[in-house]
Amino acid sequence: GSETDVNECDIPGHCQHGGTCLNLPGSYQCQCLQGFTGQYCDSLYVPCAPSPCVNGGTCRQTGDFTFECNCLPGFEGSTCERNIDDCPNHRCQNGGVCVDGVNTYNCRCPPQWTGQFCTEDVDECLLQPNACQNGGTCANRNGGYGCVCVNGWSGDDCSENIDDGNSGLNDIFEAQKIEWHENLYFQGHHHHHHHH
């Protein structure tokens, strides 16, 4: 047979202190008058007990039935429920893409850069010990690397054999030519760094 919802609100006294009973499927809810709270409107409402402020916000009672939340940096809203987006003011460098944090932001860096703001150059020569072949020397550059080839070899990674007539040439290949001038290592705050 079909289930019939019992209207709990037909039975008086569920909601105290003048509260209005609202029937719900399989349940009911009390809508309390100002100054009362709780499932049955049986408790006196004290604005900051418990605190409605979230994300570490501090509650301050401003009246008999009103409160104000003082939010921690990075949060906003009447109960500090919203994390402020820090990306509109971001300073991600060298092609980094902003990722919002709590009262800060981080940068998702392209492969050649690292650090919280993508200001630290990745040393490709350390990451790829065999980047240059046939005895070529790897030279780290800001935003990339280069191979200095020994006589007789050329190409991106010194893998191309040069004819004897050109054997005096050294070829310097810049894997990624980006005109940055100096490495930057941010000291401290390593927990913010996103390495890619």
Partner: antibody, heavy 120, light 107 residues
């Protein structure tokens, strides 16, 4: 050699308009954030506006004091940065510097500055 | 906006003196601090970036230190060409903000 050369400053009446230019050379313009910074006579430095690089879609940020009045833009084909200044006020009187944000959270190259005087 | 409190506003010193300028920020800027030197009628010149990194071509008598909200610029032995105004600037987020400046004068 990195060079930035501003032009376009001059005397203008309150409520008037002026367009500043900054011609750059010696680096790949589209790779860098570019900034406008101003300095009133005998006062400190005040950041005005910025345009991020190509990797950040050339997005723009303004200081609260010039928002809705000033417009920053760039022409990559001419390697030139612009600052269109409308509804000018006497308090906008300053030397305006164009500067390059060198990829290290600092302004590593500056132009010589161009003087903007707003007076009736 | 991040507030920058730079002190002192001026300092009188002699050639050879050690000069220290401090900059305090209203929130953590993760070492995204730069120092500039400006002489009358000239553009600012970058001295230090990343709180402690010396810009190319800047003499080693200039040094920077600090983290979090407290930063310092030190000139170890003041030279005649160092008499100028110095500014700190945070590069952590927009709007970029500068300290009020410190004028280093001859005693």
């Amino acid at each position: 050699e990195v060079q930035l050369v501003e032009s376009g400053g001059g005397l203008v009446q309150p409520g008037g308009s002026l367009k500043l230019s900054c011609a750059v050379s010696g680096f790949t313009f589209s790779d860098f954030y570019m900034e406008w910074v101003r300095q009133a006579s005998g006062k400190g430095l005040e950041w005005v506006a910025a345009q991020r690089n190509k990797a950040n879609d050339f997005s723009i940020v303004y200081s609260a004091s010039v928002k809705d009045r000033f417009t920053i833009s760039r022409d990559d084909s001419k390697s030139t940065l612009y600052l269109q200044m409308n509804s000018l006020k006497t308090e906008d009187t300053a030397v305006y510097y164009c500067s390059r944000d060198g990829g290290k959270l600092a302004l590593d190259a500056w132009g010589q500055g161009t003087l903007v005087t707003v007076s009736s | 906006d991040i507030q920058m409190t730079q002190s002192p506003s001026s300092v009188s010193a002699s050639v050879g003196d050690r000069v220290t300028i401090t900059c305090q920020t209203s929130e953590d800027i993760y070492s995204g601090l730069a120092w500039y030197q400006q002489k009358p009628g000239k553009s600012p010149k970058l001295l230090i970036y990343g709180a402690s990194r010396l810009q190319d071509g800047v003499p080693s008598r200039f040094s920077g230190s600090g983290s979090g909200t407290d930063y310092t610029l030190t000139i170890s032995s003041l030279q005649p060409e160092d008499f100028a105004t110095y500014y700190c600037q945070q590069g952590f987020k927009y709007p970029l903000t500068f300290g009020g400046g410190t004028k280093v004068e001859i005693k």
